[in-house]
């Protein structure tokens, strides 16, 4: 069990595993066909850097140049699209940074980068107002990279609207996805806009695109599936986050915690609190309050936003992330200044990684 006491008004049970998983999304680099693209591997202290595309080792060729921490793609084509990764090998460990490359003609791509959720249009689907397909909630489709352990099941969904009601079809790696393309086939529920693949295996890795169309238009959205066979590691938190912050009384502040995890991570934002004037319980453990956690009703758990802060909000804020392998945590301090003082950056204070363990 975690070595801390929870304030009684907290409803979360920290030792329970998550029902929600959250993996920081890779950056997306967009290029038009024919353009050149240069990406820098954003990893520090890299003795040796290796590159992969869609899980396959990437070596230099006449269009791909690898120089130190830079990857250059000359004369990009749609076939260059995919999930890239650079891995920095060090003497004691290795670290991987993922990014997506999307080589597409933006005008005709039909993808949802700039789409809206359509909620503001108030168009009756039963009226004569004909409408091209649209995503009903683009926010929920922002997570494109999904890591699923082998032998489990994945469900991709692309809920959409339109008038007449659009149809949906699925592509794998840009080609029609046929039942015979995988052992056991797959299942589609058009009324739920979903594709289910049971008992995934490494050959299921790849890009899955839902294409939604009616006579007035077509849109598509691509998810990348990674089937995790390797032993997952405990969560990794981006160094320097959350960052210390200061604000005046009545101000707003935001802490960000970037999480990298193969297995489902459960994110908690925790603060030291006092109970009956004491910071510690009878067992000698500090009183902690869970301010936010990942769950089915939680918005982006990687961000903790505090509004209209008071002096009581000052203190240490801990981002604690756990998966079934282990946990990691980092903290930041919030300084609340009287209204007449201007805010400034605080000295960095890093929590011991074993703080909550």
């Amino acid at each position: 069990r975690p070595s801390f006491s929870l304030v009684e008004d907290t409803t979360l049970e920290p030792e329970e595993p998550p029902t929600k998983y959250q993996i920081s999304q890779p950056e997306v680099y967009v290029a038009a066909p024919g353009e050149s693209l240069e990406v820098r591997c954003l990893l520090k202290d890299a003795a040796v850097i290796s590159w992969t595309k869609d899980g396959v080792h990437l070596g230099p060729n006449n269009r791909t140049v690898l120089i130190g921490e830079y990857l250059q793609i000359k004369g990009a084509t749609p076939r260059d699209s995919g999930l890239y990764a650079c891995t920095a090998s060090r003497t004691v460990d290795s670290e991987t940074w993922y990014f997506m490359v999307n080589v597409t003609d933006a005008i005709s791509s039909g993808d949802d980068e700039d789409d809206t959720d359509g909620a503001e249009d108030f168009v009756s689907e039963n009226s004569n107002n004909k409408r091209a397909p649209y995503w009903t909630n683009t926010e929920k489709m922002e997570k494109r990279l999904h890591a699923v352990p082998a032998a489990n099941t994945v469900k991709f969904r692309c809920p959409a609207g339109g008038n007449p009601m659009p149809t949906m079809r699925w592509l794998k790696n840009g080609k029609e996805f046929k039942q015979e393309h995988r052992i056991g086939g797959y299942k589609v529920r058009n009324q739920h806009w979903s594709l289910i693949m049971e008992s995934v295996v490494p050959s299921d890795k790849g890009n899955y695109t839902c294409v939604v169309e009616n006579e007035y238009g077509s849109i598509n959205h691509t998810y990348h599936l990674d089937v995790v066979e390797r032993s997952p590691h405990r969560p990794i938190l981006q160094a320097g986050l959350p960052a210390n912050a200061s604000t005046v009384v009545g101000g707003d502040v935001e802490f960000v915690c970037k999480v990298y995890s193969d297995a489902q991570p459960h994110i908690q934002w925790i603060k030291h609190v006092e109970k009956n004037g004491s910071k510690y319980g009878p067992d000698g453990l500090p009183y902690l309050k869970v301010l936010k956690h990942s769950g089915i009703n939680s918005s982006n758990a990687e961000v903790l936003a505090l509004f209209n802060v008071t002096e009581a909000d000052a203190g240490e804020y801990i981002c604690k992330v756990s998966n079934y392998i282990g946990q990691a945590n980092q903290s930041a301090w919030l300084t609340v200044l009287p209204k007449q003082q201007a805010p400034g950056r605080e000295k960095e204070i890093t929590a011991s990684p074993d703080y909550l363990e």
Epitope: E13, E16, P17, P18, T19, K20, Y21, Q22, K140, M141, K143, H146, V148, P149, A150, A151, N152, T153, V154, K155, F156, R157, C158, P159, R189, Q191, H192, S194, I196, S199, Y223, S231, P232, Q264, I296, Y324, I325
Partner: antibody, heavy 127, light 107 residues
Framework: EVQLVESGGGLVQPGGSLRLSCAAS????????ISWVRQAPGKGLEWVGR????????NYADSVKGRFTISADTSKNTAYLQMNSLRAEDTAVYYC????????????????????WGQGTLVTVSS | DIQMTQSPSSLSASVGDRVTITCRAS??????LAWYKQKPGKAPKLLIY???FLYSGVPSRFSGSGSGTDFTLTISSLQPEDFATYYC?????????FGQGTKVEIK
């Protein structure tokens, strides 16, 4: 063929202990999980707890938390339910079930489904 | 805990009948709902997962529908082997919870 076989049930006095075993075969043991579900005589199903076989992480129903412990021996492809401080209301047939996750990429949750079940073993707590 | 309420608690039907069992969750569980069938003295068997997906090897006369809080299991044409108790189960919230069961008996 996937198979789960429970053993270890029997009669025990209130306050006593018992360890149930669930021997698994026919699937990659560490890829998924094992759940324990019980059914009191003439009653419905009650979820007891679950372990992820990759590392033995667990969670439990409130009614058994602190008294029951789920563990696994991957070298033997066997999961265990250690039951301590048993009470009369723990009397039931105990089933183990292979449990896998359905990862919903849209609403970002994992649904746990129990697809293969053992035959069950009866635990009677009585003085 | 999320409460699951099934109705009816029991029903009598004949071979060939269309049977519908409903399950209501006390809070939104999206489509995270499974249906199981259990015969006396036997272990439960998975029929439907994710509210509407037929599990491998389950006859197509079984179907599931619903999302949010209201779900339905339908047997389009009841067969002799279908006389059993049926349970719904949600697995979005902790702990996983079952409905109290619906017993389908021969009329």
């Amino acid at each position: 063929e996937v198979q789960l076989v429970e053993s270890g049930g029997g009669l025990v006095q209130p306050g006593g202990s018992l360890r149930l075993s669930c021997a698994a075969s026919g699937f990659p043991f560490t890829s998924t999980g094992i759940s324990w579900v019980r059914q009191a005589p003439g009653k419905g199903l009650e979820w007891v707890g679950r372990t992820h076989l990759g590392d033995g992480s667990t969670n439990y129903a409130d009614s058994v938390k602190g008294r029951f412990t789920i563990s696994a021996d991957t070298s033997k492809n066997t999961a265990y339910l250690q039951m301590n401080s048993l009470r009369a209301e723990d009397t039931a047939v105990y089933y183990c079930a292979r449990t896998y996750g359905i990862y919903d990429t849209y609403d970002m949750y994992t649904e746990y489904v129990m697809d293969y079940w053992g035959q069950g073993t009866l635990v009677t707590v009585s003085s | 805990d999320i409460q699951m309420t099934q109705s009816p608690s029991s029903l009598s039907a004949s071979v060939g009948d269309r049977v519908t069992i409903t399950c209501r969750a006390s809070q939104d569980v999206d489509t995270s709902l499974a249906w199981y069938k259990q015969k006396p003295g036997k272990a439960p068997k998975l029929l439907i997962y994710s509210a509407s997906f037929l599990y491998s090897g389950v006859p197509s006369r079984f179907s599931g529908s619903g999302s949010g809080t209201d779900f339905t299991l339908t047997i389009s044409s009841l067969q002799p082997e279908d006389f059993a108790t049926y349970y719904c189960q949600q697995s979005t919230g902790h702990p996983q919870t079952f409905g109290q069961g619906t017993k389908v008996e021969i009329k």
